[in-house]
Interface confidence: medium
């Protein structure tokens, strides 16, 4: 299953499959997730070790049992791969690291005015993997405002050094934010020239293309089909690069297929997994396990659930079957691809779906009428769970925010439906940043069911929570994916990095904003909050947030939207924007429904086959 917990001051001993330099534990975890054999990782921050060579060291590990002995090491951070973690799987990494220089091959230098501009240049350059930016206060005047675009053989820095007034980060191409655009065409009977960066076996050109997309140095590829004239080269997928970023030449060649990495696609990237099943094909590899199952789909599910399994073959040979069940061979290799592909067999083969973003249909949990005032513009994919709840009675308008918590579920505030409980009139827009981008052709979700908390009463602040079941499940993308929910009764976690987002008013008597706004707001204790709202009861099922001096807050139109906090590198939905006295007033914090207190209710409603059957009318 999916394990998200991080172990502080702990280091996994043994099991090493790769090592690299990464700026933090989260990036190390992402590299582990995408490494075909990595199940566990350990990271050494600069503060944890004196050995300069091991600072920022990221150690990727495998284990037959799925675990390794942990040894105490002050400052070290260890954890699990996010394989099998559905929507949490992403190669996108937005963080900017201050005081850190990520070293690599510097292939381009230019003067820019900000680190964001430097990151944008890297994202818009086909070969750039990461960058460093010297700020205006850098000690050498001639280097100030320099933006260095970089790459390395493995896609990670060749070294990371602590250096004042330098900021570093990664290309946002894996966030589907590149302005370059991509070539979707597949070219039949054409072979590309240039440098081979890797060679793997794949059953078709589409798997080859996906592998190229997620390989740090692949820009284009050539695939040799299973009828290619040289037997030893059949099903070979050659991952390629070139100085210019495009093939320098191409040769007409029977039974070859070529194409490009899709990493530079804007707004949508292919999933980092291969779901197709190949009948009449055997995949060879190291045997992990053999089990009897009924049907090839069950074989794929079995492979997906066994975290080390990379691909499988389901045999229909009479000697491999008994009654209705046949042998399911679960296999793996060093690079995650079959070591041999055979055609015309009585088997069917395919890959594990452990890296698919879709995950299951449940809501995301972890194992353990109110624009934002004082906020700033958000960027694409920054808050991919944020949705806009709009009403189309006559003119269409944004009324509330909401949070995507599963393929078919949105969490919002009950008061959004006061006087408008009709599911027909609502339209739910997800994966958007600007409200002005919504046209008559913009897809939206319709509501199948509105589930208002049974104890919510109109015009009262209590139990201000509602679930929306969508008519059809949504696919997850970099711009549209769910927020994880907190653990039930989560009271021990101290959240210090919390944000409220929405399109609501920018002042008390304002108007709905076009660009999604964000504001960083500190949580306030319930005791402190109660002092500020002596006419109301602040219950333990509420959470408050705001600055003593005011100036930053949620406001009308943000209601139902998320209050999210980042803890151990993971965002969680801590609150639902509910109410407050005015907006951003001094000593008047915003009041939010505390999601952790409603976990039983959320899970009951989302996991029951028919929420309606258990829905009670508001008491």
């Amino acid at each position: 299953g999916c394990l998200t917990q991080l172990y502080e001051n702990a280091f996994f001993r043994g099991g090493d499959v790769a090592s690299m330099y990464t700026p933090n534990a989260q990036y190390c975890q992402m590299r582990c997730t995408f490494h075909p054999r990595c199940l566990l990782f350990s990271f050494l921050p600069a503060s944890s070790i004196n050995d300069m060579e091991k600072r920022f060291g990221c150690f990727l590990k495998d284990s037959v049992t799925g675990t390794l002995p942990k040894v105490h090491r002050t400052g070290a951070v260890s954890g699990h791969s996010l394989k099998q973690c559905g929507h949490q799987i992403s190669a996108c990494h937005r963080d900017i690291y201050k005081g850190v220089d990520m070293r690599g091959v510097n292939f381009n230098v230019s003067k820019v005015s900000s680190v964001e501009e430097c990151q944008k240049r890297c994202t818009s350059n086909i070969r750039c993997q990461f960058f460093s930016y010297a700020t205006q206060t850098f000690h050498k005047a001639e280097y100030r405002n320099n933006c260095l675009l970089k790459y390395s053989p493995g896609g990670t820095p060749t070294a990371i050094k602590v250096l004042s007034n330098v900021e570093s980060g990664f290309s946002l191409k894996p966030c589907a934010l590149s302005e370059i655009g991509c070539h979707m065409n597949i070219f039949q009977h054409l072979a590309f020239s240039d440098v081979d960066v890797a060679r793997v076996l794949t059953p078709d050109a589409f798997v080859c293309r996906t592998i190229c997309t997620y390989h740090p140095n692949c820009l284009f590829f050539t695939f040799y089909t299973n009828v290619w004239k040289i037997e030893s080269q059949r099903n070979v997928c050659l991952l390629k690069t070139s100085e210019s970023g495009t093939p320098s030449s191409s040769t007409p060649q029977e039974n070859t297929i070529s194409g490009y990495s899709l990493l530079t696609c804007k707004r949508t990237l292919p999933e980092p997994c291969h779901s197709k099943i190949y009948p009449g094909v055997d995949f060879g590899g190291e045997e992990l396990n053999v089990t009897f199952v009924k049907g090839v789909n069950v074989c794929q599910e079995t492979c997906t659930k066994m975290i080390r399994c990379q691909f499988f073959t389901y045999s229909l040979l009479p000697e491999d079957c008994k009654e209705e069940k046949c042998k399911c061979f679960l296999r793996l290799s060093m690079d995650g691809s079959p070591t041999r592909i055979a055609y015309g067999t009585q088997g069917s083969s395919g890959y594990s779906l452990r890296l698919c973003n879709t995950g299951d249909n449940s809501v995301c949990t972890t194992k353990t009428s109110t624009r934002i005032v004082g906020g700033t513009n958000s960027s694409w994919g920054e808050w991919p769970w944020q949705v806009s709840l709009q009403v189309k009675l006559t003119a269409q308008r944004h009324l509330c925010g909401g949070s995507l918590i599963g393929h078919q579920w949105v969490l919002t505030a009950a008061h959004c439906f006061d006087g408008l409980p009709l599911q027909d009139v609502w339209r739910i827009y997800s994966g958007i940043l600007n409200l002005s981008d919504i046209t008559k052709d913009t897809p939206f979700s319709q509501i199948k069911e509105i589930i208002i908390h049974q104890n919510y009463k109109v015009s009262e602040g209590n139990h201000d929570i509602a679930l929306i079941k969508l008519q059809a499940p949504l696919n997850y993308t970099e711009f549209q994916k769910p927020i994880c929910l907190p653990s039930k009764g989560d009271t021990s976690t101290i959240y210090t990095n919390c944000w409220v987002t929405g399109w609501g008013f920018s002042k008390e008597k304002g108007e709905i904003q076009n660009i999604l706004q964000k504001v960083n707001i500190p949580l306030v204790t319930n005791e402190e909050c109660q002092k500020r709202y002596q006419d109301y009861k602040i219950t333990q099922r509420m959470v408050c947030a705001g600055y003593k001096e005011g100036g930053k807050d949620a406001c009308k139109g943000d209601s139902g939207g998320p209050l999210v906090c980042k803890h151990n590198g993971m965002w969680r939905l801590v609150g639902i924007t509910s109410w407050g006295e005015g907006c951003a007033r001094r000593e008047q914090p915003g009041v939010y429904t505390k999601v952790a207190e409603y976990m039983d209710w959320i899970l009951e409603k989302t996991q029951s086959s028919d929420g309606k059957a258990q829905m009670q009318s508001p008491a």
Partner: antibody
Amino acid sequence: EVQLLESGGGLVQPGGSLRLSCAASGFTFSLYLMHWVRQAPGKGLEWVSSIYSSGGFTTYADSVKGRFTISRDNSKNTLYLQMNSLRAEDTAVYYCARDTDYGMDVWGQGTTVTVSS
Amino acid sequence: DIQMTQSPLSLSAFVGDRVTITCRASRDISVYLNWYQLKSGKAPKLLIYGASSLQSGVPSRFSGSGSGTDFTLTITSLQPEDFATYYCQQSYSIPFTFGGGTKVETK
């Protein structure tokens, strides 16, 4: 092909009733807001009534409120207008129309209702 | 209710002429304004939605402009098939209301 086809019009006496139907084809009827619009002889277009996708919300022009009822059967891809207590001023060609976010993009050919003694 | 006032009531023009029809709303309707063409015995046809967006399949000689209260439909080069009655309609608030229509006749 996306199509709307009205039926049920005819001659009726004042105070009488009539039920108009509109059969939809070529699109997912259950996803669309639908309207009835009419045009009286020598006059302009007049919006009559609307119904939201699942039928849970309806709205009417003041001139027909309380007398006309709009409904739909999504399983049959059909829109209806039940017209009671008909008056001479209800004489018109009645059109059904499909709604997009902004306008009515698909219309039927119309069915004629004549209210006369 | 929002009143929609169309002008002129009718106009005569030659094939090839540039024709402009205006529509005024009694209050701000943003861009929730649509234009329709109606020929006798035929179904009305949506030409322009959202004040300025051309409905697919409609010739580019038709264009719409305006927002708030004042809107215009322009036919840049009138064709024989364009002789018809044109209606504006607001979809900003219920009741949806149409303008009185403008009949475009041949000179």
